[in-house]
């Protein structure tokens, strides 16, 4: 039998640095998780102590602090090299500044084979990215070869900006003739590799012939055997067994995200190449695990563009912009409105002619916006202003929900209305009329949703059975404030960009902004 | 520890239907496959099909495909094989197995007899 | 659908006896084998699979060889409670098939 070791990481998410285990800015050093410096050593300790060692990565290392921000994916290609990782299929969120934005700083830069099957270039891009990104890599680990096959959702024309010039196929019919390559080339060890979620993960386990392993990303999946180190509540085991329609048995592994875990799995295939056991968990890379000297010092020296950066002008407000709890949490605020037009244009995705855009509706509560922005400092915007709104570090995520649960929420949003609660709705593309003199649970008299499916955007009622997207901070796709009626009923829920981020590029591109408030809350007459 | 109880023995008419209960405990019903098997007597064992609880992926083997129905209920750890039109042949013990990572019949119910006569 | 033959389909022997079962699969089905034992009345036991791994709890008594087509179940050392009938399976492919069974008798 011959034994492989494969670390692995996903949805990394722009963490390079240590942070705080609920995975946002570190504030208390001793209790810090993670982070690249954190992850070497580890990688290393493993390295040194067993003979075959694959160290992959399943996709989003871009989009999610202010390091990709600021270095736009060349901070990734840098220290991923200095980690010597093997291998790295693409995630969605590679895709988001661009095709450029991906093959300058990542593809050119990597020294390790970054991975997909089931994307296809056409058109001038096709010679321009030829060979900067493979369907899969044969890579010799001991004395044996192992083949690695790349997947990517779907689903990414939906959710970043890969432009026309890329087919996202259908990951099973992609990935099959590629693993049956590499068995022609008796290749008899095969790993799928790949940034669709854990649902796909499992299918790809269950239906490509061939694959004997599976790497996940995409949805954040946390699998733990035994009692779980930390505040994640495992949705399987470590590793998560598949029975394959011809029969094998098929690992499929994931690592939660932000590098706040090394996923460690060890495979043992017998002769013919066949997997005979396996067994692992995830590792909290947390405090107890030292930094590593060297990946620490370069990580400070990248870090001093960082803060020059926070204090620089992004644009101009010519209007005060008020995210007081004051407005936010009781009526309409233009803050609340600046933030929904800034994460729907951060959506707009003109892949179907019927449709102007995929998705129009914006919610977001309240008691997420912390501050307002003063326009009497010159009207200058900086990144610091916008870590004062957003301090949280979460993510704007596109879900899709039906109606019923959008008119609970609406409910929700005003059950206890004027105790200053945080759960009261900012809007966009909604116009929702609330009446206070109704009891709790039956306020919501009017809500109209911008539609899609139309060339003239209008509003009209919202259907019941109709199933939306909506752009929502993760906070609430999470059930955060009490909507728990989002967490048990949404139907499909993908991670977005990090919520700064979003706000700060829809100042950039606008240069001046003014925000109003527009009527899109309204409270209907002798209530309120 | 893991047990697997299966439901008790049926004598059922020709074109009949029956449905054999296996009830899981000791384990996380939704995390591991339920095979089902047969058993004539004195002949060899026969794999019936597969479900998984967790998503509820099913898997038949073809010449069981038509009269065989697999079936789970999460909140009763409970799988169930209902066998339709029932003729003489299908007359056996019918046994509900569970995998273990790696090993595929590792934990087995203690069988239910099924009776097919007129 | 791989057939799989067993040998002998009885067979007689002592306690404290060396036994071997062959099990012989209609095609190449690499290492993946398993072997049961079954007892009158009773469901199998899972004994062996991929070829020679014991299942938990299984005497070291009880050892597996073989590749391709052709494997063998081993009883170093037969104790009384080892009579029983014995069922080769393969898991290389669906539909998964089992041997016709070898029932080893006290002599």
């Known amino acids: 039998a011959w034994e492989l070791t494969i670390l692995h990481t996903n949805d990394v998410h722009s963490r390079l640095e240590q942070t705080s285990e609920d995975s946002s800015k570190c504030v208390n050093a001793s209790r810090c998780m993670g982070g690249v410096a954190r992850l070497f050593t580890k990688v290393q300790q493993i390295r040194r102590a067993e003979p075959n060692v694959l160290l992959l990565d399943a996709g989003d290392q871009y989009q999610g602090t202010i390091w990709f921000t600021v270095y736009k994916g060349a901070e990734v290609a840098h220290f991923m090299n200095a980690l010597r990782y093997d291998a790295m299929a693409l995630g969605n969120h590679e895709f988001d500044n661009g095709v450029e934005g991906l093959i300058e700083p990542l593809l050119k830069e990597a020294k390790f084979p970054i991975l997909s099957a089931n994307i296809k270039a056409k058109g001038p891009l096709a010679s321009q990215i030829s060979g900067l990104y493979l369907p899969y890599k044969v890579l010799p680990v001991g004395d044996e070869v192992v083949g690695i096959v790349g997947y990517t959702s779907k689903e990414t024309p939906f959710l970043s900006n890969p432009g026309t010039n890329l087919v996202f196929e259908d990951e099973i019919t992609a990935l099959q003739p590629e693993v049956d390559k590499l068995k022609t080339l008796n290749v008899n060890k095969i790993i799928a590799l790949g940034h669709s979620g854990f649902e796909m993960d499992k299918l790809i386990a269950q239906k490509v012939r061939g694959v004997d392993v599976v790497v996940g990303g995409h949805s954040n999946t946390f699998l733990y055997t035994g009692n779980p180190p930390s505040k994640e509540v495992p949705a399987g085991k470590y590793p998560f067994i598949v029975t394959s329609d011809d029969g094998r048995k098929v690992p499929v592994v994931q690592a939660y995200a932000f590098g706040k875990y090394l996923g460690y799995l060890k495979i043992e295939f017998d002769e013919r190449g066949n997997v005979i056991s396996s067994h692992g968990n995830p590792i909290l890379l947390n405090s107890s695990i030292p930094e590593d000297p060297s990946i620490k010092a370069d990580i400070n020296k990248w870090r001093i563009k960082l803060d020059n950066y926070s204090t620089q002008e992004l644009g101009k407000t010519i209007v005060y912009l008020d995210g007081s709890s004051q407005s936010c949490r009781f009526r309409e605020c233009n803050m609340g409105n600046l933030i929904c037009d800034a994460m729907i244009n951060n959506n707009l995705r003109h892949t179907d002619e019927m449709f102007w855009n995929h998705v129009s509706m914006c919610i977001l509560n309240g008691g997420g916006i912390r501050s307002p922005i003063d326009e009497r400092n010159n009207g200058t915007i900086t990144w610091e202003n916008l870590a004062a709104v957003l301090p949280f570090g979460g993510t704007f995520d596109l879900v899709q929900l039906k109606g019923s649960t959008l008119k609970k929420a609406f409910e929700h949003s005003v059950h206890r209305y004027g105790q200053s609660t945080g759960e009261f709705l900012q809007v966009g593309g909604i116009h929702v009329v609330y009446d206070l003199s109704r009891k709790p649970g039956d306020r919501v008299v009017k809500l109209d949703v911008l539609c899609t499916k139309c060339r003239v955007p209008s509003y009209d009622p919202l259907k019941m059975d109709e199933v939306y997207k909506v752009i929502l901070p993760n906070f609430l796709a999470n059930g955060g404030d009490g909507f728990q009626m989002i967490k048990d009923e949404l139907l499909r829920h993908d991670s977005g960009d990090q919520d700064i981020n979003v706000v700060s590029t829809y100042i950039s591109k606008m240069k001046v902004i003014y925000p109003a408030v527009e009527g899109r809350i309204k409270f209907s007459t002798g209530s309120h | 520890q893991v047990q697997l109880v299966q439901s008790g023995a049926e004598v059922k008419k020709p074109g009949a239907s029956v449905k054999v209960s296996c009830k899981a405990s000791?384990?996380?019903?939704?995390?591991?496959?339920i095979y089902w098997v047969k058993q004539r007597p004195g002949q060899r064992l026969e794999w019936i099909g597969w479900?998984?609880?967790?998503?509820?992926?099913?898997k038949y083997n073809e010449k069981f495909k038509g009269r065989s129905t697999l079936t789970a209920d999460k909140s009763a750890s409970t799988a169930y094989m209902e066998l339709s039109s029932l003729r003489s042949e299908d007359t056996a013990v019918y046994y509900c197995?569970?995998?273990?990572?790696?090993?595929?019949?590792?934990?087995w119910g203690q069988g239910t007899l099924v009776t097919v006569s007129s | 659908d791989i057939q799989m033959t067993q040998s002998p389909s009885s067979l007689s022997a002592s306690v404290g006896d060396r036994v071997t079962i062959t099990c012989k699969a209609s095609?190449?089905?690499?290492?993946?084998v398993a072997w049961y034992q079954q007892k009158p009345g009773k469901a199998p036991k899972l004994l062996i699979y991929?070829?020679?791994t014991r299942h938990t709890g299984v005497p070291s008594r009880f050892s597996g060889s073989g590749s391709g087509t052709d494997f063998t179940l081993t009883i170093s050392s037969l104790q009384p409670e080892d009579f029983a009938t014995y069922y080769c399976?393969?898991?290389?492919?669906?539909?998964?098939?089992f041997g016709q069974g070898t029932k080893l008798e006290i002599k």
């Open positions: 197995a569970r995998d273990d990572n790696y090993a595929w019949f590792a934990y």
């Open positions: 000791g384990y996380t019903f939704t995390n591991y496959y």
């Open positions: 991929w070829t020679n």
């Open positions: 479900i998984y609880p967790g998503n509820l992926n099913i």
């Open positions: 399976q393969q898991h290389y492919s669906t539909p998964f098939t």
């Open positions: 095609q190449d089905v690499s290492t993946a």
